[in-house]
């Protein structure tokens, strides 16, 4: 498990957000687990990070992820609603300078080291699709979500709104 230095335990509201989408509106350190309460863990293997979905032993400490929340304007010509809307996007960083990335070609979720500004592949649209669960939709590939496949995180195409509540794309955020 990785610690993230200099991050407050609780959410920190940032006041330097002069341009929507550039600075996070808030940051939150949380553990990530699946709908079925398996933990998302991160391990350094052969100088690269691997992401696992696993059951933790009773007193095993959960890995924490820094979630940075960004407010994104969604222009009316894209929304189809005739009005500009706002949505929340997140980046997820389990350790300093590394962020979850969507690899749309491989349908995989990977940890990449990168500097800010982060590429679009590191941003995910946040959905509350089920009671107290969230889903993460790829900014670069609408309709594709982070999901669980064979005890790993993968990118999963969701074909219709009825499938937005399927358990394998639902995650829980917890401080503990």
């Amino acid at each position: 498990a990785f610690g993230i230095s200099g991050v407050q335990k609780y959410t920190r509201a940032l006041h330097d957000s002069s341009i929507t989408g550039i600075s996070p509106i808030t940051e939150y350190l949380a553990s990530l687990s699946t709908y079925n309460d398996q933990s998302i863990t991160f391990a350094l293997e052969d100088e690269s990070y691997e992401i696992y979905v696993e059951d933790l032993k009773k007193d095993e400490k959960k890995d924490k992820v820094l979630l940075s929340y960004y407010e994104s304007q969604h222009p009316s010509n894209e929304s189809g609603d005739g009005v500009d809307g706002k949505m929340l996007m997140v980046t997820l960083s389990p350790t300093k300078d590394f962020w979850l990335h969507a690899n749309n070609k491989e349908h995989s979720v990977e940890l990449h080291k990168c500097e800010k500004p982060l590429p679009d592949q590191a941003f995910f649209v946040l959905h509350n699709m089920h009671s107290n669960c969230v889903s993460f939709e790829c900014k670069t590939d609408p309709g594709v979500f982070i999901g669980v496949k064979d005890n790993h995180l993968a990118l999963i195409k969701v074909d219709s709104s009825e499938n937005l509540c399927t358990e394998n794309i639902l995650f829980k955020l917890s401080e503990t």
Partner: antibody
Framework: QVQLQESGPGLVKPSETLSLTCTVS????????VHWIRQPPGKGLEWIGV???????GYNSALMSRVTISVDTSKNQFSLKLSSVTAADTAVYYC???????????????WGQGTLVTVSS | DIQMTQSPSSVSASVGDRVTITCLAS??????LAWYQQKPGKSPKLLIY???RLADGVPSRFSGSGSGTDFTLTISSLQPEDFATYYC?????????FGQGTKVEIK
């Protein structure tokens, strides 16, 4: 522009079912969560429940056994049903829409004007 | 369920006064708190969301602060149109509970 409009009977008898409809325009129910909130005369706001963009629902635990929220996307409407009502359910009932696409984290930016429902025989 | 406790329940103030309303959550809710203003016979109006973000069209004399469990709404210089009831609401987890309200009255 975005609008929400509540409609339904203003008077319901005790033990019957309260039924309200919220008709929306200017946005898609497939993209935004919508909520029912009520306010008894002279009292505070009470959240009743949500219909999320993905179609799932969530309810106030104190009302859960009596409340149902459903949607008719073809009519741009969502509905509230509250069964076995008593005088304590007398309130102004509001429908409201989330601030953010797909997420309730940003609060409710658009509200209907509210409709008073009185429970009395 | 998360309980939201607002204080004070009412406050008497004059035009130009600085008014502070607090909201305490029974468990941590991150930054997911909204503040609403409601005038008699009217629907609530969103003032602040995500604890600190000013909603569109809301005057800059309104500001929000706090995170975790403790939150504050401040009106820096009270105007005649600000006399109303103010509610906080947590949006971290369903059910999305409201505080009991704070009535700002003319002194």
């Amino acid at each position: 522009q975005v609008q929400l409009q509540e409609s339904g009977p203003g008077l319901v008898k005790p033990s019957e079912t309260l039924s309200l409809t919220c008709t929306v325009s200017g946005f898609s129910l497939s993209k935004y969560g919508v909520h029912w909130i009520r306010q008894p005369p002279g009292k505070g706001l009470e959240w009743i429940g949500v219909l999320r963009a993905g179609g799932s629902t969530g309810y106030n635990s104190a009302l859960m056994s009596r409340v149902t929220i459903s949607v008719d996307t073809s009519k741009n409407q969502f509905s509230l049903k509250l069964s076995s009502v008593t005088a304590a359910d007398t309130a102004v009932y509001y429908c409201a829409r989330d601030h953010y696409y797909y997420s309730s984290y940003g609060g409710f930016v658009y509200w209907g004007q509210g409709t008073l429902v009185t429970v009395s025989s | 369920d998360i309980q939201m406790t607002q204080s004070p329940s009412s406050v008497s103030a004059s035009v130009g006064d600085r008014v502070t309303i607090t909201c305490l959550a029974s468990q941590t809710i991150g930054a997911w708190l909204a503040w609403y203003q409601q005038k008699p016979g009217k629907s609530p109006k969103l003032l602040i969301y995500a604890a600190t973000r000013l909603a569109d069209g809301v005057p800059s004399r309104f500001s929000g602060s706090g995170s975790g469990t403790d939150f504050t709404l401040t009106i820096s210089s009270l105007q005649p149109e600000d006399f109303a009831t103010y509610y906080c609401q947590q949006l971290d987890s369903s059910p999305y509970t409201f505080g009991q309200g704070t009535k700002v009255e003319i002194k």
